[in-house]
């Protein structure tokens, strides 16, 4: 991954914080939030982008070359944006305009554009589709996707908070 210009860390921090809140509002669980079940081999099996140790999102990795980590976050944002665009969220029960889900979708797009302003070719991604006999699964899939997104955004927000605190270019005073 080539080293390129750094993002606006402070703006990314603000947007990612807002996204965390929106994801929570879109699906606030009953009771306490527990951690996702994850297994090491699930990454390759399901092609679900997760921020892992080797992605360079730790403080040292960000300092050395933040592009590795940012690329991972970009992939995750694109993945979840595609899911929010899929039949799972577009079908019944319909989502209301300006609902937390719609706001979440808009903000995901906003952060993606902030990280990736130029037009990159989209990776082809297999979207889950439900047969007529599987329509009952839609609410469960929405819940699982939003729970997974909440976990992803929580880590991304920590990355941007660290970047904003330590990697932001200091302002040069003018004479």
């Amino acid at each position: 991954v080539p080293r390129s210009s750094s993002p606006d860390w402070a703006q990314c921090q603000q947007l990612s914080r807002n996204l965390c809140m929106l994801a929570w509002n879109a699906h606030a669980p009953a009771g306490h939030m527990n951690l996702l079940r994850e297994e090491e081999d699930e990454e390759t099996k399901n092609n679900v982008p997760r921020i892992q140790c080797e992605d360079g999102c730790d403080p040292q990795g960000l300092k050395d070359n933040s592009q590795f980590c940012l690329q991972r976050i970009r992939q995750g944002l694109a993945f979840y944006k595609h899911l929010l665009d899929s039949d799972i969220f577009k079908g019944e029960p319909a989502l209301l305009p300006d609902s937390p889900m719609e706001q979440l979708h808009t903000s995901l797009l906003g952060l993606s554009q902030l990280l990736q302003p130029e037009d990159h070719p989209r990776e082809t991604q297999q979207m889950p589709s439900l047969s007529s006999s599987q329509q009952w699964q839609r609410p469960l899939l929405r819940s699982k996707i939003l729970r997974s997104l909440q976990a992803f955004l929580a880590i991304a927000a920590r990355v941007f908070a660290h970047g904003a605190a330590t990697l932001t270019e200091p302002l040069v005073p003018t004479a």
């Epitope: 699906h27 606030a28 669980p29 009953a30 009771g31 527990n34 996702l36 079940r37 994850e38 297994e39 699930e42 099996k45 399901n46 679900v48 899911l83 889950p128 699964q137 609410p139 469960l140 899939l141 929405r142 819940s143 699982k144 996707i145 729970r147 997974s148 997104l149």
Partner: nanobody
């Protein structure tokens, strides 16, 4: 892997009620979406109701909407199916199942209980 044991089935008259329970062990119960399915004699196993990991999202088959209610108690590792206004056509073996998929983009009820018989007489 999670083990599931159903209870609460029995013989009831049409219009009556039953409450099924499904006790889970051997897994992180609060991580799993849970579902109830049923199989009538000579028929395929059909979806009845399901609930997400936290209990905030539920979904039902059209045939039981308004009559059945699924709920869960994560502290007790148990999922329930409250069945009211029972009809003879609700007669079946009722199975509890856990979504064993770690992926957010699939549902896989891969772990099943042994079932409990519900018979509704007219």
């Amino acid at each position: 892997e999670v083990q599931l044991v159903e209870s609460g089935g029995g013989l009831v008259q049409a219009g009556g009620s039953l409450r099924l329970s499904c006790a889970a062990s051997g897994g992180t119960f609060s991580s799993y979406a849970m579902g109830w399915f049923r199989q009538a004699p000579g028929k395929e196993r059909d979806f009845v109701a399901a609930i997400d990991w936290s209990g905030s999202t539920t979904t039902y088959a059209d045939s039981v909407k308004g009559r059945f209610t699924i709920s869960r108690d994560n502290a007790k590792n148990t999922v329930y199916l409250q069945m009211n206004s029972l009809k003879p056509e609700d007669t079946a073996v009722y199975y509890c199942a856990a979504d064993m998929s770690h992926s957010p983009i699939e549902i896989d009820f891969g772990s099943w209980g042994q079932g409990t018989q519900v018979t509704v007489s007219s």
